[in-house]
Every structure is written in structure tokens, then in C-alpha cells.
């Protein structure tokens, strides 16, 4: 029992429980396919415990294996709209440092209006994750339709 | 090594490892869009370790950040069926206490017959999660096609 | 602080942090619907920490509840292709030992070219997971489009 108490008294950061869940803030200007995210209790149910936002992109603070997950829903969308605007594609990747740039997860919308996926991937302190939405449709800003998050899983 | 042994002897509940995976029991009467869930080893591969079921809805027992995930497949469904009955929508939310009612995750089927997603969200002891399926198609009760679960991630 | 250091010095395996993320190696011969996986840092961002590969199938080394996730994208696919080749179905299950054979997760592509899902399930040491893709379309081997992984969650 003393051990359990001691464990609870440790700062969570020392246990490596980095976690973040973000909501969409805005899209970039026309030539910038990146989605810009925001997080924090004042905004609703989004949060950052460990990772940070750098100009709307998520920056990792702790080395480790992470579960990365995302859902993006297109605004005012029907299957007809989605197929007409194909290809609309969402890619999550490390965009900086440039030496580590790589696409981690990629999905196309085809005739659907929502994509959702998740994967495990090693990330290093300083890695910045970008989410690129290519196509001519806007993502929904509803917090239950579009979100992006990471969870530290192990060193 | 002694530490590892001590850790294993702690009751798992004190480590905050609350987790549940549920299978569909039944749908509600016509005016009730909620899906009713069941869980337990006697039923197959579903289980509840911490959370509880309250009239087929999942009630949280420990404050924390949770990974919530769901997959729902429509019964006897083709892309034609699915598109004809658009909008068929699945929403996961906190339905009680009423003061905390909010939609956490929402997806439409469009021309697909399965939705699957996951997200991180803060939940509090006593929160009850409801899964609402709106539309005129039945969800599959096959345990590998329709399931709903939560996993405690951190305080 | 000494506790945190002690924790870090423990072998991770003793904490039960088994985790794997795999990339597609190849498909089987025509009568074999199984996907064959590969993993390891030399291959990119895939890895195995605990579980092992047995002839391209994932074998579990530690009892517990696991989060299983998968994404499969069909190669050279459009919604027209996908619907024309329906039913194309992906199933993840325990394929050995035979006494524990069961389908854990199943999705059809319908008019889409990607499926992605995840679920919690109990797995036992020695369980081998197979991923069966039925249909006449090939899965993409791009590592950001097709991947399969497991994460130990709790005993």
C-alpha cells in the first residue's frame, strides 16, 4: 500500500505518461496543406500533458514508442461530394527535423467523409508531427468529428 | 528484482488499469437510439475490469484520461443500402450525469457499412457513456464486427 | 526520485510492455488469404518488443489484454474498383493453437480502399495472430498505408 501511495506521489512526467489530444484550430493558407491544431482545458476536452504545440503542430518532448491516432471529417460532405473531390488525402508524418521527415500514416477519403486510424511509431524528443490534408474540401471543426492525439506507450 | 515482484503483488486496480471491451447485446426500442452492451468472459472475449454496466451502458469508476474505441458494422449491408439510408450516424458521448453530457466521437456511414474510430478523452468516476445509432439499419451483433471499449491511460 | 531511477533500470520486459508494429512483407500464394508481415528497425519504423514473428505471423509471448490495431489499404484502388471487387474483407484472428482459433476483428472494404480499426482482446502466450485478406485486390506495401500492431495493456 505504501508503494501505491509513493507511486501516486511521483510526478506523472517521470513515469513517461506523455499524452495529448487536440482539436482543429484552422487550416493553413491555400498552398499549405497542414492542419493547425489547438489544445487545452479551456477549449473543451483537448489537452497536452508533455507534448507541446509549435505554431499549431505537435512537438514531442519524450523519446519512446507512441500510439498516434487521428480522425478527420470533411465539412458539408456527402459520398457524392467526397467522390467528386477525389483524391482527398490525409497524411500524418514527422515534418521536422527535416532529417527525420517521413510519412507515418496516410488515408484517402474516396466516397467517404470521415477517415480514422491509429498506429504505433517510435518518436524522438523534438519530432514535430504534421497532418496534411490535400484536396479542396474543408475539415469539420466539430470536436467530436475531427481530432488528433498521441499517447506514449513505452521507451 | 524485489521491486518487480512487489509491483506484481499490488492489486491491479491500485495501478489504475481500468479497461473494458463490450459486445452488442441489443438495440433499444424504436424511439431509443442507444445501443445496449454486454460484457464478461462467459460471453466470449468481452470483459470489464473496473468500469461497470448500468442497464447496458458503460459507467466509469476511475477518474482519468481514457482511450475510447468503437467499431459498428451494419447488418446485411451493402454500399447501396448504406447510401440509401444516409444519414446513418454513430455517436459516442457522456449521457449522464446530465451536467457533463457531451458528444465525444461521431461518424456517419455514408456509403460504408462499418465505422471504426478511437480517441483520448478525460472521464470522471460516474460518467456513463452512451452509443447512439441513428438510422433504420440494424447493427451486426457479431462480436468481431461490433464492439466498444475503454482503456484507462493516465490520471 | 530514486524510485523513478530504479524503475528505469528494470528490464522493460518485466513491466509487461510487450509491443509490436509490423509492415507488410508479402501476400501468400493464391489459396492462402493470409498477409505475411515483417518488422525490425532495419526495415524502417516497424519493431517487435516481446512478440515474435513465426513465418510472417505474429506470435504473442506474454499473457494479457492487448490492443490490436490494423490498417490495410488496397493497391491501385478507387471506389469503383473496390465496389466492383466486393466482397473484399479483412479479418484478424487467432489462428493457432487451433483450440483457440477465433475471429477477433473483421471489416469489409465496400466502396472504400482502406480499412482501419482496433480492439482490446485477451491474448495468451503462444497465440498466433493471422490477418486474412479475401478478395482479388492486392494490399499496398507502403508502410504508411498498411500496418498491423499489438500493444500489451494489462494482465
Amino acid at each position: 500500500q505504501r508503494f501505491a501511495q509513493a507511486q501516486q506521489q511521483l510526478p506523472l512526467e517521470s513515469l513517461g505518461w506523455d499524452v495529448a489530444e487536440l482539436q482543429l484550430n484552422h487550416t493553413g493558407p491555400q498552398q499549405d496543406p497542414r492542419l493547425y491544431w489547438q489544445g487545452g482545458p479551456a477549449l473543451g476536452r483537448s489537452f497536452l500533458h508533455g507534448p507541446e504545440l509549435d505554431k499549431g503542430q505537435l512537438r514531442i518532448h519524450r523519446d519512446g514508442i507512441y500510439m498516434v491516432h487521428i480522425q478527420v471529417t470533411l465539412a458539408i460532405c456527402s459520398s457524392t461530394t467526397a467522390s467528386r473531390h477525389h483524391p482527398t488525402t490525409l497524411a500524418v508524418g514527422i515534418c521536422s527535423p527535416a532529417s527525420r521527415s517521413i510519412s507515418l500514416l496516410r488515408l484517402s477519403f474516396h466516397q467517404g467523409c470521415t477517415i480514422a486510424s491509429q498506429r504505433l511509431t517510435p518518436l524522438a524528443r523534438g519530432d514535430t508531427l504534421c497532418t496534411n490534408l490535400t484536396g479542396t474540401l474543408l475539415p469539420s471543426r466539430n470536436t467530436d468529428e475531427t481530432f488528433f492525439g498521441v499517447q506514449w506507450v513505452r521507451p | 528484482q524485489r521491486f518487480a515482484q512487489a509491483q506484481q503483488q499490488l492489486p491491479l486496480e491500485s495501478l489504475g488499469w481500468d479497461v473494458a471491451e463490450l459486445q452488442l447485446n441489443h438495440t433499444g426500442p424504436q424511439q431509443d437510439p442507444r445501443l445496449y452492451w454486454q460484457g464478461g468472459p462467459a460471453l466470449g472475449r468481452s470483459f470489464l475490469h473496473g468500469p461497470e454496466l448500468d442497464k447496458g451502458q458503460l459507467r466509469i469508476h476511475r477518474d482519468g484520461i481514457y482511450m475510447v474505441h468503437i467499431q459498428v458494422t451494419l447488418a446485411i449491408c451493402s454500399s447501396t443500402t448504406a447510401s440509401r439510408h444516409h444519414p446513418t450516424t454513430l455517436a459516442v458521448g457522456i449521457c449522464s450525469p446530465a451536467s457533463r453530457s457531451i458528444s465525444l466521437l461521431r461518424l456517419s456511414f455514408h456509403q460504408g457499412c462499418t465505422i471504426a474510430s478511437q480517441r483520448l478523452t478525460p472521464l470522471a468516476r460516474g460518467d456513463t457513456l452512451c452509443t447512439n445509432l441513428t438510422g433504420t439499419l440494424l447493427p451486426s451483433r457479431n462480436t468481431d464486427e461490433t464492439f466498444f471499449g475503454v482503456q484507462w491511460v493516465r490520471p | 526520485q530514486r524510485f523513478a531511477q530504479a524503475q528505469q533500470q528494470l528490464p522493460l520486459e518485466s513491466l509487461g510492455w510487450d509491443v509490436a508494429e509490423l509492415q507488410l512483407n508479402h501476400t501468400g500464394p493464391q489459396q492462402d488469404p493470409r498477409l505475411y508481415w515483417q518488422g525490425g528497425p532495419a526495415l524502417g519504423r516497424s519493431f517487435l518488443h516481446g512478440p515474435e514473428l513465426d513465418k510472417g505471423q505474429l506470435r504473442i509471448h506474454r499473457d494479457g489484454i492487448y490492443m490490436v490495431h490494423i490498417q490495410v489499404t488496397l493497391a491501385i484502388c478507387s471506389s469503383t474498383t473496390a465496389s466492383r471487387h466486393h466482397p473484399t474483407t479483412l479479418a484478424v484472428g487467432i489462428c493457432s493453437p487451433a483450440s483457440r482459433s477465433i475471429s477477433l476483428l473483421r471489416l469489409s472494404f465496400h466502396q472504400g480502399c482502406t480499412i482501419a480499426s482496433q480492439r482490446l482482446t485477451p491474448l495468451a502466450r503462444g497465440d498466433t495472430l493471422c490477418t486474412n485478406l479475401t478478395g482479388t485486390l492486392l494490399p499496398s506495401r507502403n508502410t504508411d498505408e498498411t500496418f498491423f500492431g499489438v500493444q500489451w495493456v494489462r494482465p
Partner: antibody, heavy 120, light 111 residues
Framework: EVQLVQSGAEVKKPGSSVKVSCKAS????????MHWVRQAPGQGLEWMGA????????SYNQNFKGRVTITADKSTSTAYMELSSLRSEDTAVYYC?????????????WGQGTLVTVSS | DIVMTQSPDSLAVSLGERATINCRAS??????????MHWYQQKPGQPPKLLIY???NLESGVPDRFSGSGSGTDFTLTISSLQAEDVAVYYC?????????FGQGTKLEIK
């Protein structure tokens, strides 16, 4: 409560066509398949086909070899079943029917039936 | 097409006694955890009336002396205590695929 009201009895010559109507009360007409089922005198029930009024999509029983056409008018919440190349064995009561809620082919609501007699 | 075969073709049961009607499908009508089998009652000059849907669900307003059971290919409609108003023809019907088909009917009479 949904009500399905069908047109009146008809007497037709062999080789001719008949068109039966079914008017649905309520505002849910476009959202539910409308089915047609017939019953020959003293015989069982036979499904003929269905229409989804929302987009006009139809499904037919191949036993009727293209003789049946189902249409719908959303503005009047009315479905129609036309059967061509009539023969004596088409003498039957024709019912429209639909499910109360789910989009599967079991039938909670039925019209009162329309007797079609084919006789020379 | 799936062929539905009811047995018996006719049945005479005393008032207050149990009546059982069987229906067999030529292939399974179960899918996605449901059995897509339904039962109707038809009285002379009236359209059929839905009694049971999805094998065992009692339609609203139907007396609970009616019950349904079965899965796969074999199904049963049971009337636990026959009443005079239960005299009718009973039909089974599947909706597992198109076209939906009906059984030939079972005529239930009072002995």
C-alpha cells in the same frame, strides 16, 4: 400511426396492364422501402418488388420477368405498382406493405389490398 | 431463392392448449447475429398481421401467448394457450436476402 390506403378493385383483360396505387399517411414516406406482395385466391403470399421513394431505387422479384414496374411520387406520398401482359393467373389481391422502422423486408403496415381480376 | 417450408399444413388444437407451427428454410436465414425470420397471422378478408420479427421479437400489441424461437434454418411459432380469436392462417417469411419468400401457410383451427 402509418396508414396505407390502396386504390379500388380492377377487372382487366388478358394482355392488358393494371396500375395499383398506395397512399401513405405521415411524413416518413421517402425514408422507407415500400413493398408489393400479392396473394392469389386461396393461395399463399408472394413478394413482387419494392421501391425506396427517397431515390426511386427499385428491386424486383425475377419471377415476374420484367412485367412489374414500381414507381413512387414523393409529393403525394404515393407508390404505384404496374403489372403488364396480364394473364388469368395474375388474378390476386395485391398489397402494399412496409416496415415500421427498420429497413429490412418484414412488414408491420399493410394496405387493405386491391383485388385485380383478369378475365376475358 | 430461399424456399420456406411450413409444417403442418393444417393444425387442430383445443382451446387453452399449446399450438406449435414449424418453418424450415432451404438455407440459413441467420446473419450478423440475427435470424431474419418473421411470422404473420392472416384472417379471411384481411391483410396479414405481423406477430413476430427477427425470430423471437414480439411485435407491439401482440399478446404474449405468441412466441417465436429458432435459428439458422429451423424456426417455431408457439401459441401457449390457444384462444378462439387465434383461428387463422399463419405464415413464416424470411428477409435474409432478396427476394424475401413466404412459407405456404399453416391453417390453425379449433379441435
Amino acid at each position: 400511426e402509418v396508414q396505407l390506403v390502396q386504390s379500388g378493385a380492377e377487372v382487366k383483360k388478358p394482355g392488358s396492364s393494371v396500375k395499383v396505387s398506395c397512399k401513405a399517411s405521415g411524413d416518413t414516406f421517402p425514408r422507407y422501402n415500400m413493398h408489393w406482395v400479392r396473394q392469389a385466391p386461396g393461395q399463399g403470399l408472394e413478394w413482387m418488388g419494392a421501391i425506396f421513394p427517397g431515390n426511386g431505387e427499385t428491386s424486383y422479384n425475377q419471377n415476374f420477368k420484367g412485367r412489374v414496374t414500381i414507381t413512387a411520387d414523393k409529393s403525394t406520398s404515393t407508390a404505384y405498382m404496374e403489372l403488364s401482359s396480364l394473364r388469368s393467373e395474375d388474378t390476386a389481391v395485391y398489397y402494399c406493405a412496409r416496415n415500421s422502422y427498420y429497413d429490412y423486408a418484414w412488414f408491420t403496415y399493410w394496405g387493405q389490398g386491391t383485388l385485380v381480376t383478369v378475365s376475358s | 431463392d430461399i424456399v420456406m417450408t411450413q409444417s403442418p399444413d393444417s393444425l387442430a388444437v383445443s382451446l387453452g392448449e399449446r399450438a406449435t407451427i414449424n418453418c424450415r428454410a432451404s438455407k440459413s436465414v441467420s446473419s450478423s447475429g440475427y435470424s431474419f425470420m418473421h411470422w404473420y397471422q392472416q384472417k379471411p378478408g384481411q391483410p396479414p398481421k405481423l406477430l413476430i420479427y427477427l425470430a423471437s421479437n414480439l411485435e407491439s400489441g401482440v399478446p404474449d401467448r405468441f412466441s417465436g424461437s429458432g435459428s439458422g434454418t429451423d424456426f417455431t411459432l408457439t401459441i401457449s394457450s390457444l384462444q378462439a380469436e387465434d383461428v387463422a392462417v399463419y405464415y413464416c417469411q424470411h428477409s435474409r436476402e432478396f427476394p424475401p419468400t413466404f412459407g405456404q401457410g399453416t391453417k390453425l383451427e379449433i379441435k
